[in-house]
Amino acid sequence: EVEKTACPSGKKAREIDESLIFYKKWELEACVDAALLATQMDRVNAIPFTYEQLDVLKHKLDELYPQGYPESVIQHLGYLFLKMSPEDIRKWNVTSLETLKALLEVNKGHEMSPQVATLIDRFVKGRGQLDKDTLDTLTAFYPGYLCSLSPEELSSVPPSSIWAVRPQDLDTCDPRQLDVLYPKARLAFQNMNGSEYFVKIQSFLGGAPTEDLKALSQQNVSMDLATFMKLRTDAVLPLTVAEVQKLLGPHVEGLKAEERHRPVRDWILRQRQDDLDTLGLGLQGGIPNGYLVLDLSMQEALS
């Protein structure tokens, strides 16, 4: 806290300019009018105030706007945004995407801070949904943003926004999140032709059900092993050897290297060894010839 002292003669700030960087903290407190600061916030970011000096300026704005800053001030906070606490940000009403972009720019290249997370939360809640422009902006600054949302939060993403998603944006998503995103992606890309559709839907396939994988296997998509390994185990298990062979195309040879890992391991255990042998990959662990396979889950469903 800076002591209240009178401004020295001739030091009263007439405008926010670079001469202020040579003021001591107490001089800034005494000589800079909060209303002047608010109207000239756009200049602050161009001036190399120390973070200690920015603390003083923040204190002035806090006194002027105890209920929270207006958007006209928020938009021009620049590096002063780094001095805000999540509690400060919760008082704000940020509606403009330009304001959001301006503040995200300050933290660009760094991990998402609690301030940024709070800002995004306030912005998205204010909009009511994650529209395409917002999602575009957020994933540009934070590729992992989408995967930081809960399945419940992801349910508010409209299918049209899925067009903004890049494969790397989904790198850290877990199956529960992909379960929510996949149907949206399927809807978003439904009017694309086969090969183009597969390119777009590929990153979301970790949420695809068996019937969709079966349909893809009829379209010569040549799925790579990395994508196959991210599929839901329960969706892969019912696929036949022929379907997996068609789904993977030339990449089918990669199954051998993955035979001890899920979902390949579990899938092998469900296939007849005879069928696996047709692949010529030396996959072992299938159901021996002459054994009968009872699907107990089907039996339970019937009883």
């Epitope: 190399p48 120390t50 973070y51 590096y79 780094l82 933290n107 290249g109 760094h110 801070s113």
Partner: nanobody
Amino acid sequence: QVQLVESGGGVVQAGGSLTLSCAASGSTFSIRAMRWYRQAPGTERDLVAVIYGSSTYYADAVKGRFTISRDNSKNTLYLQMNSLRAEDTAVYYCNADTIGTARDYWGQGTLVTVSS
């Protein structure tokens, strides 16, 4: 984290010149502004010069005599001091602040003594 190490201080005659260096290491990519401060015995630490992007700023007392510069390829900040006066005698400190962490970092200081 950013580490700053100053060098180049020493004893110089009034009217002479000296160049201070400040080598930065660590998370130098996140540095926002760099500054030279000085502190004479028994006084507060005063801001001498700042480099911020391509802009430079100087305290009135050193304007026209001192030049701040930065070599990004060497991660080094400089302060070229000409026409030195007895009142320039002080410990000179290098300072940097960073984006993201919004933190200030300081060097250990280097003593400049101007003898008349």
